[in-house]
Interface confidence: low
């Protein structure tokens, strides 16, 4: 037993209570004063906070209960203050006292991982033992009550590729992993409290692993062998052909440049087309059909970055074989852009020039361009390449055309070449806001003032980068209508409130409220929108939702009394 | 109205890392695109990298990776832009910008600017 | 070096009209829009032409900018003292994946 220093006849034991007990009362222990000799004359009370509702004391015994279910993870700790009365005098035999209740902890809560979601990044190739990520779970528990919040990592899945250090939550690599064969990985790992003694809890989490590049694959030609033409009338920087090396990496690693070997004439070069990573075979002289018909060369690829440690693996360039066969012949025009994007804002008059494509002969004689222009009937070209509008442009109908300009050489139309055009129409503010339903509005004739009556909303057709945001206003021309009100909600919404108390069907069957809708364009439209406000007679309940059938007799020309 | 606000300037030694802050206001964090642009002493703009405030992805200039970390914390509506290893060269003034909702699309607004100083 | 090309320097006297070129690649340029930024002494850049060339709201119609295969250009008609700036133009770069700037244009207004 425990004495109390302050309060010397009181006698009570350390007190602890189990969380989670479902029985209705669980004896907690029992409070006495060495001054009561068991015939029932004291009085024992129990204050303070779950005094009663929580814990109760039997009043001759001491004894304490709890008779509540008590959870140490919402409040671990009880602070109580006890009394003892003699029941003869009804005076205090003891001095009040403060007593503790302890809530014990009880194994009822699986280790948590709170910084979900985890992603990690990591080379492929990467050694065993590299860190990838640390995952940390968290048991609400008490810690200093066995082993119930003491945590063991496990690896559900991820194995062979992945380990996990149990009691860190470290995990690292154990065997090495070709981003080119998979580049992302989905781990779980399970953590279980009691150090994965019988009876733990356990909580999973997921890791993405995704695997960052190295430059471990060398470009390789999947073609060996090329077979091009070129008319001898080619200009000097004319595209022969496009050859295409292959490389598994990505981004940078990927990044290739190409050159010519056994060329000893130099006619020929390899430029790179950087989208693509192709490489355009140009022509660095002039060839003569008459004097050589076709030219035999190698071309070499290799990566523009290699890393000294990655070296071995780009060892042997690729290379493939090209045959170059002079023709003598006329060629087709030829544009100066693959494709074209034009742009105009949208709302222009008729024969806007909306720009210009342009395309050229390159055989020697330069023969002049004719363009045909299809795709649209909106836009037409002339004889320099230059597209205009034959009609105003209206975003809302097509904010984008595709168009196809065809170019054909005036001295042999046979030589027919084409481009595609893409015209982007930019957005004016060109549509003013407008209702976005028609309202079927009804007010009571018994409404008060301030009831709502209908609450509206807009749409406007154009399109914003910024949300759209609505004006709604009252007309100031709807001088005749005092009997509601408009509120902006400042949401693209605005509710209309009755002003009045009481309407009257037969004097005012229906009332034309003007509403302004503006919205936030630059410069900012308006519409001016009218809703109608049937009154109605919706008996005691002042619900509308009747009025649509009367309104409907009343707009046939009937009237229900 | 849009807001981009920095913290205040550093003086750091080579070698040291700073992180500096911008802290986005009046539009919605997670519809833009940030992005950091540095301007040393005398020269131009240099793009440093673009971070995805929605889901936090990042994308860096080839210039700095591996030295620049650049994340976000949404209940704060405030990017960070961490440079590490230090050097002279460093020295700059570190703006923050938004992007549009596209990653060709122009920086409509900008920070005030923080001025980094790499100094033994 | 920038991987867009612009003078570095530019004069003008007020009421003049000067242009300012930025020269890159398909890469950039000739795949993407250009953007102007200009610059007052001691503060950040602000946008003054987006998308080849639209003028943000509060931008004079004095700044005008256009873009025509791998180059761009901007326009200042009417100079005044108060366009005494530097100016950057802008694109993104399909190649690198990134923002690519011209090095700058230091305009001065003489007189």
């Known amino acids: 037993d425990y004495k109390d220093d302050d309060d010397k006849g009181w006698v009570w034991n350390q007190f602890f209570v189990p969380e989670e007990m479902n029985t209705t009362s669980h004896h907690i222990g029992q409070l006495r004063s060495d001054l009561d000799n068991g015939n029932n004359s004291f009085q024992y009370k129990l204050l303070g906070a779950g005094a009663g509702s929580t814990f109760i004391i039997d009043e001759r015994t001491g004894d304490i209960y709890a008779i509540q279910k008590l959870d140490r993870e919402e409040r671990s700790l009880y602070i109580l203050r006890a009394q003892v009365i003699d029941i003869a005098t009804g005076r205090a035999v003891e001095p009040e006292s403060e007593f503790v209740i302890k809530v014990s902890d009880i194994n009822d809560n699986e280790p948590r991982f709170l910084d979900e979601p985890y992603e990690a990044i990591v080379p492929e190739m990467s050694p065993e033992g590299t860190f990838v990520i640390k995952v940390t779970a968290n048991d609400a528990d008490d810690p200093s009550t066995g082993y119930h919040a003491r945590i063991l990592y496990n690896l559900e899945r991820g194995q062979p590729y992945f380990s996990v250090e149990p009691t860190t939550g470290v995990i690292r690599i154990s065997s090495k992993m070709d981003r080119e064969l998979q580049d992302t990985y989905c781990v779980i790992i399970q953590a279980k409290d009691m150090l994965g003694q019988p009876g733990a809890l356990s909580g999973t989490t997921t890791v993405s692993i995704k695997l960052s590049d190295i430059n471990d694959n060398k470009p390789i030609f999947k073609e060996s062998f090329y077979r091009f033409t070129i008319s001898e009338s080619a200009p000097i920087g004319t595209s022969i052909g496009k050859i295409m090396a292959y490389d598994d990496d990505i981004g940078e690693n990927a990044e290739m440049e190409y050159s010519i070997e056994d060329d000893d004439s130099k006619i020929f070069d390899i430029i790179i087309d950087n989208d693509t990573q192709e490489g355009i075979v140009i022509l660095k002289k002039k060839v003569d059909f008459e004097q050589q018909s076709y030219y035999g060369i190698r071309a070499k690829v290799k990566n523009c970055h290699v890393d000294e440690e990655l070296a071995p693996a780009h060892v042997n360039a690729s290379t493939t074989y090209i045959k170059v066969q002079v023709e003598d012949e006329d060629e087709p025009p030829v544009f100066l852009l693959p494709y074209y994007i034009l742009e105009i804002p949208e709302g222009k008059p008729y024969g806007t020039i909306v720009g210009t494509v342009s395309a050229t002969d390159p055989d020697r004689r330069q023969s002049p361009m004719r363009y045909y222009l299809t795709g649209s009937k909106m836009f037409d070209i002339n004889d320099n390449g230059t597209i205009i509008t034959t009609n105003m442009l209206d975003r809302e109908v097509s904010a984008w055309y595709n168009l196809t300009v065809t170019a054909t050489e005036t001295y042999n139309v046979q030589q027919i070449s084409s481009a595609h055009v893409y015209v982007q129409v930019f957005n004016i503010n060109d549509n003013a806001p407008e209702f976005s339903q028609f309202y079927e509005t009804y007010v009571c004739e018994n409404a008060e003032s301030g009831e709502i009556v209908q609450i509206i909303s807009a749409i406007d057709r154009d399109e914003s980068i910024e949300d759209h945001h609505f004006y709604f206003n009252h007309s100031l021309e709807d001088t005749n209508n005092s009997s509601f009100m408009l509120t902006d909600n400042q949401d693209n919404t605005a509710v209309i409130l009755s002003n009045r108390t009481g309407f009257n069907l037969k004097e005012e069957p229906v009332f034309y409220m003007i509403i302004l809708i503006a919205d936030n364009g630059i410069p900012s439209l308006t519409s001016t929108n009218t809703l109608t406000i049937q009154v109605c007679d919706c008996g005691d309940s002042r619900n509308t939702e009747t009025c649509a059938n009367k309104g409907l007799l009343f707009i046939m020309g009937f009237r229900t009394e | 109205q849009v807001q981009l606000v920095q913290s205040g300037a550093e003086v750091k030694k080579p070698g040291a890392s700073v992180k500096v802050s911008c802290k986005a206001s009046?539009?919605?964090?997670?519809?833009?695109?940030i992005h950091w642009v540095r301007q040393a002493p005398g020269q131009g703009l240099e793009w440093m990298g673009i971070i995805n405030p929605s889901g936090g992805s990042t994308r860096y200039a080839q210039k700095f990776q591996g030295r620049v970390t650049m994340t976000r914390d949404t209940s704060t509506s405030t990017v960070f832009m961490e440079l590490s290893s230090l050097r002279s060269e460093d020295t700059a003034v570190y703006y923050c910008?938004?992007?549009?909702?596209?990653?060709?699309?122009?920086?409509?607004?900008w920070g005030q600017g923080t001025l980094v100083t790499v100094s033994s | 070096q920038s991987a867009l090309t612009q003078p570095p320097s530019a004069t003008g006297t007020p009421g003049q009209r000067v242009t300012i070129s930025c020269s890159g690649s398909?890469?950039?340029?000739?795949?993407?829009?250009v953007n102007w930024y200009q610059q007052l002494p001691g503060t950040a850049p602000k946008v003054l032409i987006y998308t080849n060339n639209q003028r943000p709201s509060g931008v004079p119609d004095r700044f005008s900018g256009s873009k025509s295969g791998t180059s761009a250009s901007l326009a200042i008609s009417g100079l005044q003292s108060e366009d005494e700036a530097d100016y950057y133009c802008?694109?993104?770069?399909?190649?690198?994946?990134?923002?690519?700037f011209g090095g700058g244009t230091k305009l001065t207004v003489l007189g």
């Open positions: 802008a694109a993104w770069d399909d190649s690198l994946n990134g923002w690519v």
């Open positions: 398909s890469s950039n340029i000739g795949r993407n829009f």
């Open positions: 009046g539009y919605t964090f997670t519809s833009y695109y």
């Open positions: 910008a938004r992007g549009g909702i596209q990653l060709w699309l122009h920086f409509d607004y």
